[in-house]
Interface confidence: low
């Protein structure tokens, strides 16, 4: 015998208290698939979270972060404070990058400047708290058409800085 609940579409639930008829999900709840015996509670985007997409009877709400914060975690499960370029977030708030390190984003940690001498290249432009060192070409690389600068190191995956 076919389960009568399998006929209940998304946006409804199979109500055992009403002889397994399909009832609409109550306010602030949803079912994204058919045949569900309960509806899931909608996510509330409160405080530092703000609504990116409203809940509907068939889909959960989606949150992002208020200005000055950025999302962390799957589905924006956390909001982390933004810092200025040249800073990183610590337990005591935003702190300037130490000498020899930089951060060119509003999130993430300060990273060491590129060591041009390890690659046998001269420093073309000094680093700052907000910008990596720019290495020049090797003396032997100064041939027509050769790239004259090395791009900065790739940004690390955004996340919590060491606390």
């Amino acid at each position: 015998l076919q389960d009568p609940c399998s006929n209940c579409p998304a946006g409804t639930f199979c109500d055992n208290n009403r002889n397994q008829i399909c009832s609409p999900c109550p306010p602030n709840s949803f079912s994204s698939a058919g045949g569900q015996r309960t509806c899931d509670i909608c996510r509330q985007c409160k405080g530092v979270f703000r609504t990116r997409k409203e809940c509907s009877s068939t889909s959960n709400a989606e949150c992002d972060c208020t200005p000055g914060f950025h999302c962390l975690g799957a589905g924006c499960s956390m909001c982390e404070q933004d810092c200025k370029q040249g800073q990183e977030l610590t337990k005591k708030g935003c702190k300037d990058c130490c000498f020899g390190t930089f951060n060119d984003q509003k999130r993430g940690i300060c990273r060491p400047w590129t060591n041009c001498s390890l690659a046998g290249k001269p420093v073309l432009m000094n680093g700052t708290k907000a910008r990596d060192v720019v290495c020049g070409p090797r003396p032997a690389d100064l041939s027509p058409g050769a790239s004259s600068v090395t791009p900065p190191a790739p940004a690390r995956e955004p996340g919590h800085s060491p606390q």
Epitope: P24, P27, N28, S29, K53
Partner: antibody
Framework: QSLEESGGRLVTPGTPLTLTCTVS????????MSWVRQAPGKGLEWIGY?????SLYYASWAKGRFTISRTSTTVDLKMTSLTTEDTATYFC???????????WGPGTLVTVSS | DIVMTQTPASVSEPVGGTVTINCQAS??????LAWYQQKPGQRPKRLIY???DLASGVPSRFSASGSGTEYALTISDLESADAATYYC????????????FGGGTEVVVK
């Protein structure tokens, strides 16, 4: 982020009329949208919703005579069989189950008179 | 449909005073309640959502509480700029109960 209603004008009873709410700064795929009206000197009266999936909800008194639809950047309210009782400022508003109506347009005036 | 009964219809208080507006729902509305302020010729402005959460940019002089069928908005330290009509609003609709506004309360600041 803003809403702007248009289409309000003086019409005679029985004339159909469509109002348009133009949205900017956000996507209609992410928010519920409502139409609300306010007769001169009276309170706010909810007409209906369109949710993020395009599902429609209407006040019981509005079913059959009012129809809400949307495009990518507009939400329309189609009104039929207008009577003098429908004379009001019509507002579109953004919001749904989470926050109430957090953003409103300035409104557009519909006057039904013979 | 849900019916929202708002009282009083009008209230007058001096600058610096306190006003409380009540809103009763015909059924339990589970705190899906917002409060709006509307001045003549203007669009409504949301003050409160979720029965008690203050909308961003709204002064803390505005506060609200309630659950089930009984809700209230309180304005303390009244300012002349608070003169307006205030509406309560039940805003959940998936249950089929519909959306409803209270009839409004006019606040006059003396």
């Amino acid at each position: 982020q803003s809403l702007e209603e248009s289409g309000g004008r003086l019409v005679t009873p029985g004339t159909p009329l469509t109002l348009t709410c133009t949205v900017s700064g956000f996507s209609l795929n992410d928010y519920w949208m409502s139409w609300v009206r306010q007769a001169p000197g009276k309170g706010l009266e909810w007409i209906g919703y369109i949710d993020v999936g395009g599902s429609l909800y209407y006040a019981s008194w509005a079913k059959g005579r009012f129809t809400i639809s949307r495009t990518s950047t507009t939400v329309d309210l189609k009104m039929t069989s207008l009577t003098t009782e429908d004379t009001a400022t019509y507002f579109c508003a953004r919001g749904g189950l989470t926050y109430g109506f957090d953003l409103w347009g300035p409104g557009t005036l519909v006057t039904v008179s013979s | 449909d849900i019916v929202m009964t708002q009282t009083p219809a009008s209230v007058s208080e001096p600058v610096g005073g306190t006003v409380t507006i009540n809103c009763q729902a015909s059924e339990d509305i589970s705190s899906y309640l917002a409060w709006y302020q509307q001045k003549p010729g203007q669009r409504p402005k949301r003050l409160i959502y979720g029965a008690s959460d203050l909308a961003s940019g709204v002064p803390s002089r505005f506060s609200a509480s309630g659950s089930g069928t009984e809700y209230a908005l309180t304005i303390s330290d009244l300012e002349s700029a608070d003169a307006a009509t205030y509406y309560c609003h039940y805003y959940a609709t998936i249950s089929g109960l519909g959306v409803a506004f209270g009839g409004g309360t006019e606040v006059v600041v003396k």
